[in-house]
Interface confidence: low
């Protein structure tokens, strides 16, 4: 999906009002210094690409993020403020339903959400300082 047509300010507002708090809730009890940020992004469309990938694509050791509150709100924000996004996600949604029935918080998931927090922060302050 090409995220360049999204309404970035509206997505930013959704992040600041709710998504950020849900991410903090998920990470509660975890030290902010526990994980190193290894994923970055260079501008807002790129950040959304990385955010979508980390939030909705199951990875080894963490297949359950899509059912979390922050993920559902992220999906809603992208569906509302990125034209045509919903249509591209129908097949992906079916795959996610099959992938996991229950929510499990693993260390790998905590690390992944820590990366997401960094990506969202970069989304709000875009532009890579070095390519």
């Amino acid at each position: 999906y090409d995220f360049t047509n999204c309404d970035f300010e509206k997505i930013k507002a959704a992040y600041l009002s709710t998504i950020s708090k849900d991410l903090i809730t998920y990470m509660s009890g975890t030290k902010s210094t526990e994980f190193n940020n290894t994923v970055s992004c260079s501008n807002r469309p790129h950040c959304l690409t990385e955010i979508q990938s980390l939030t909705f694509n199951p990875t080894a050791g963490c297949a359950s993020l899509a059912k979390e509150m922050f993920a559902m709100k992220t999906k809603a924000a992208l569906a509302i403020w990125c034209p045509g996004y919903s249509e591209t996600q129908i097949n992906a949604t079916q795959a996610m339903k099959k992938a996991r029935k229950s929510k499990v918080t693993t260390n790998k998931c905590l690390e992944q959400v820590s990366q997401l927090q960094g990506l969202w922060r970069r989304f709000n302050r875009p532009l890579l300082k070095q390519q």
């Epitope: 360049t4 260079s42 501008n43 532009l127 890579l128 070095q130």
Partner: antibody, heavy 117, light 107 residues
Framework: EVQLVQSGAEVKKPGASVKVSCKAS????????MHWVRQAPGQGLEWMGM????????TLIQKFKDRVTMTVDKSTSTAYMELSSLRSEDTAVYYC??????????WGQGTTVTVSS | DIQMTQSPSSLSASVGDRVTITCRAS??????LAWYQQKPGKSPQLLVY???TLAEGVPSRFSGSVSGTQFTLTISSLQPEDFATYYC?????????FGGGTKVEIK
């Protein structure tokens, strides 16, 4: 209304320094990055570097690393670009431009710097 | 560094003509390209960003497109106020670089 107002034209001798200012208004100064771009007479645009007004972190292209200093004064929403050890090839119009995603939606009016002995 | 090769460097056209300017990136920059218009003695003005998004207040006769690493700015029907120099610029990452410019002159 967003405005970037730059300081006036400067005439300098080779070896001297020049400090160009860029006063921002009409938006939250620390939200946008400030970039500096120059244009030699009859030539194209050349990106010099950028500064993040929120934390003053700067990125400069290699050719300017030793001679350019970019600073901001958050209290007055002003960005500065100082170029030292001036030479004749630094004669150009210097622009400040604000950006969030790397494209420039507002530019200053430009400051002409002439280096001549 | 990413090199931006802009062509032609100049062109002559008449009012009402369709004008096409191209810019090629030396590597993949996705849709991270902007187009600017500059008139003599003035600052550049943003026309298009993210390769195809028209900036606020820019007339609809301007449009941008992308195919791989080649980017195109099209003016569908040239107007007297469009005679100027046009620059492309990638905004994929540091260092930002501009194309050499295309001067659109009156035939």
């Amino acid at each position: 209304e967003v405005q970037l107002v730059q300081s006036g034209a400067e005439v300098k001798k080779p070896g001297a320094s020049v400090k160009v200012s860029c006063k921002a208004s009409g938006y939250t100064f620390t939200t946008y990055w400030m970039h500096w771009v120059r244009q030699a007479p009859g030539q194209g645009l050349e990106w010099m570097g950028m500064i993040d007004p929120s934390d003053s972190e700067t990125t400069l292209i290699q050719k300017f690393k030793d001679r350019v200093t970019m600073t901001v004064d958050k209290s007055t929403s002003t960005a500065y670009m100082e170029l030292s050890s001036l030479r004749s090839e630094d004669t150009a119009v210097y622009y400040c431009a604000r950006t969030l995603d790397g494209y420039y939606d507002y530019w200053g009016q430009g400051t002409t710097v002439t280096v001549s002995s | 560094d990413i090199q931006m090769t802009q062509s032609p460097s100049s062109l002559s056209a008449s009012v009402g003509d369709r004008v096409t300017i191209t810019c090629r990136a030396s590597e993949n920059i996705y849709s991270y390209l902007a187009w600017y218009q500059q008139k003599p003695g003035k600052s550049p003005q943003l026309l298009v960003y993210f390769a195809k998004t028209l900036a606020e207040g820019v007339p609809s006769r301007f449009s941008g497109s992308v195919s791989g690493t080649q980017f195109t700015l099209t003016i569908s029907s040239l107007q007297p106020e469009d005679f100027a120099t046009y620059y492309c610029q990638h905004h994929y990452g540091t260092p930002w670089t501009f194309g050499g410019g295309t001067k659109v002159e009156i035939k």
